[in-house]
Interface confidence: medium
């Protein structure tokens, strides 16, 4: 069991400068730790690649909305 106090913090130091079509994204998580230099969103793609993105960008906000809706309406 990892020690919560000393758990490593994942930070983003650079953001992708290219959009990723929403259908290539599987999930996301927000990075808001004060230990990180900037707030970020980490997208996980359908091939399990992790990509840092800028939460201020419209495509990032659109993508998070899309993924949130996918969770709310599971496929039959």
């Amino acid at each position: 069991q990892p020690d919560a106090i000393n758990a490593p913090v994942t930070c983003c130091y650079n953001f992708t400068n290219r959009k990723i079509s929403v259908q290539r994204l599987a999930s996301y998580r927000r990075i808001t730790s004060s230990k990180c230099p900037k707030e970020a969103v980490i997208f996980k793609t359908i091939v399990a690649k992790e990509i840092c993105a800028d939460p201020k960008q419209k495509w990032v906000q659109d993508s998070m909305d899309h993924l949130d809706k996918q969770i709310q309406t599971p496929k039959p």
């Epitope: 959009k19 990723i20 079509s21 929403v22 259908q23 290539r24 419209k58 495509w59 659109d62 899309h66």
Partner: antibody, heavy 122, light 107 residues
Framework: QVQLVESGGGLVQPGGSLRLSCAAS????????MSWVRQAPGKGLEWVSS??????????SYAASVKGRFTISRDNSKNTLYLQMNSLRAEDTAVYYC?????????????WGQGTLVTVSS | DIELTQPPSVSVAPGQTARISCSGD??????VYWYQQKPGQAPVLVIY???NRPSGIPERFSGSNSGNTATLTISGTQAEDEADYYC??????????FGGGTKLTVL
């Protein structure tokens, strides 16, 4: 360099059918979405239909004005986009452009063909 | 679909700044794209993602988008900029919505 060349336009009677083609070259065709956009004489641009890229299993979408009458398709082995137009009406008269896009849903068109004219008249 | 409204025409003297507006509900929350179309030619993308220029497009073309209005600005307008200009945005499922177009006349 990217090239899109439309063909198949012409004069057709109301109720008739026509199939447009768009031959693509200079890019990896299957990785891009493709659309048809039309422009009636002296009027503005109107999006007609899109077929997405390999990442979305080539999903299709249509404008309400053509849904049920037009069918978009693609042959990735031939780098060609198609638009099958049935039950044509006078208001379908327009120059039809094919155009490519990369990302969904942020669809914008970075390259366009020169267009092919479809005239629906008796 | 998002409805985009443009003025039918805008006139500008050579060397002056032309501004073409495009309005729509909460447009600032979406990306806006601009195309130039000269008579008998296919449209050409001049601005993407609100304010980015594709390679080969002169620096005098710029874009902005906030609130309900996006604006295409052409600084130091030249005679060759005379054309129709269309704004475009998107909805879900790869559908695209175009404005009605603005005819730019360079006096």
């Amino acid at each position: 360099q990217v090239q899109l060349v439309e063909s198949g336009g012409g004069l057709v009677q109301p109720g008739g059918s026509l199939r447009l083609s768009c031959a693509a070259s200079g890019f990896t065709f299957r990785s891009y979405g493709m659309s048809w956009v039309r422009q009636a004489p002296g009027k503005g641009l109107e999006w007609v239909s899109s077929i997405e890229h390999k990442w979305t299993n080539y999903a299709t979408s249509y404008a309400a004005s053509v849904k049920g009458r037009f069918t978009i398709s693609r042959d990735n082995s031939k780098n060609t986009l198609y638009l099958q137009m049935n039950s044509l009406r006078a208001e379908d008269t327009a120059v039809y452009y094919c155009a490519r896009f990369e990302f969904t849903p942020w669809t914008y068109f970075d390259f366009w063909g020169q267009g092919t004219l479809v005239t629906v008249s008796s | 679909d998002i409805e985009l409204t443009q003025p039918p025409s805008v006139s500008v003297a050579p060397g002056q700044t032309a501004r073409i507006s495009c309005s729509g509900d909460n447009l600032g929350k979406k990306y806006v794209y601009w195309y130039q179309q000269k008579p008998g030619q296919a449209p050409v993308l001049v601005i993407y993602d609100d304010d980015n220029r594709p390679s080969g497009i002169p620096e005098r073309f710029s874009g902005s988008n906030s609130g309900n209005t996006a604006t295409l600005t052409i600084s130091g307008t030249q005679a060759e900029d005379e054309a129709d200009y269309y704004c475009q945005s998107y909805t879900a499922q790869s559908s695209a919505s175009f404005g009605g177009g603005t005819k730019l006349t360079v006096l």
